[in-house]
């Protein structure tokens, strides 16, 4: 599940990873847009595990994870869901 | 420091049934997805199963699901395959292997390995 | 299932050769392609998790490369304790698999 948050909170991310997870250990992504006190776009992965690591959004695994679930969202296929939330 | 010690192997006949057992030290056991995986003689690895913590999500390779069980006890830190109606080519070390799931994703230790035989 | 077609299935090489082995996914990985190490009568040891990092302890000369489809395992100076058999593995997605190895040896 592929979810974009618009938030007035300041950066979560302190630390970013680049290592690849696979999609089986991923309950959701979370991507908070630049802007409302963050100047950098971040990814939050949720975990199946219930941890969280933040992914550092120049990663080149996730953007492939990206581009493939913007794919399947702009098919029939009902896969990712995308949330704004707007405060 | 991290110790997997698998054991159950043995000789049995063609048919037969065979439970290996995997004994965990050193790790917090309950957090951690587990897999059997096995090499037969002179060949490469084959992936068997996997295993999640709380035991509710298992994976098979899709030529052993119907023979072949795999199953964890946390409070004995703990992990087991049991095999059923073993063919000669079930014949391999079979080893036991933690997937981590917290930073690298990949099997990060691997215990010594079990043969197991199956001949008559 | 996803086939990881490994390349070559053995080499000879000298002490401090450049020695690079080949994986290709037969559909998309991303980079969910680890490398391990295996010395005769031994387990596998983990070298290389995502692609190209080198796991806790892994020497500076073994590196790993490649996204999708194509990988790549380098030893930059072959030493005499690298002798093993070397084998990728795909973790992108399950039934999880393994390349079919390769055969170090010394020349």
């Known amino acids: 599940v592929l979810e974009v948050y618009y938030t007035s909170l300041r950066c979560r991310c302190v630390q970013e990873s680049s290592v690849f997870i696979p999609r089986r250990f991923i309950d959701r992504i979370q991507i908070l847009p630049r802007g409302n006190g963050c100047p950098r776009k971040e990814i939050i992965v949720w975990k199946k595990n219930k941890s969280i690591v933040c992914v550092d959004p120049q990663a080149e695994w996730i953007q492939r994870m990206m581009e493939v679930l913007r794919k399947r969202s702009s098919s029939t296929l009902p896969v990712p869901v995308f949330k704004r939330k707007i405060p | 420091e991290v110790q997997l010690v698998e054991s159950g192997g043995g000789l049995v006949q063609p048919g037969g049934s065979l439970r290996l057992s995997c004994a965990a030290s050193?790790?917090?056991?309950?957090?951690?997805?587990m897999s059997w995986v096995r090499q037969a003689p002179g060949k490469g690895l084959e992936w068997v199963a996997e295993i999640n913590p709380e035991s509710s999500t298992i994976n098979y390779a899709p030529s052993l699901k119907d023979r072949f069980t795999i199953s964890r006890d946390n409070a004995k830190n703990s992990l087991y395959l049991q095999m059923n109606s073993l063919r000669a080519e079930d014949t391999a070390v079979y080893y036991c292997?933690?997937?981590?799931?917290?930073?690298?994703?990949?099997?990060?230790?691997w215990g010594q390995g079990t043969t197991v035989t199956v001949s008559s | 299932d996803i086939q990881m077609t490994q390349s070559p299935s053995s080499l000879s090489a000298s002490v401090g050769d450049r020695v690079t082995i080949t994986c290709k996914a037969s559909q998309d990985v991303n980079t969910g392609v680890a490398w391990y190490q295996q010395k005769p009568g031994k387990a596998p040891k983990l070298l290389i998790y995502?692609?190209?990092y080198r796991y806790t302890g892994v020497p500076s000369r073994f590196s790993g490369s490649g996204s999708g489809t194509d990988f790549t395992f380098t030893i930059s100076s072959l030493q005499p304790e690298d002798i093993a058999t070397y084998y990728c593995?795909?973790?992108?997605?399950?039934?999880?698999?393994f390349g079919g190895g390769t055969k170090l040896e010394i020349k």
């Open positions: 050193g790790i917090d056991f309950s957090r951690y997805w």
């Open positions: 593995q795909q973790y992108y997605s399950t039934p999880l698999t």
């Open positions: 995502s692609a190209s």
């Open positions: 292997a933690r997937q981590d799931d917290t930073r690298y994703y990949a099997m990060d230790y």
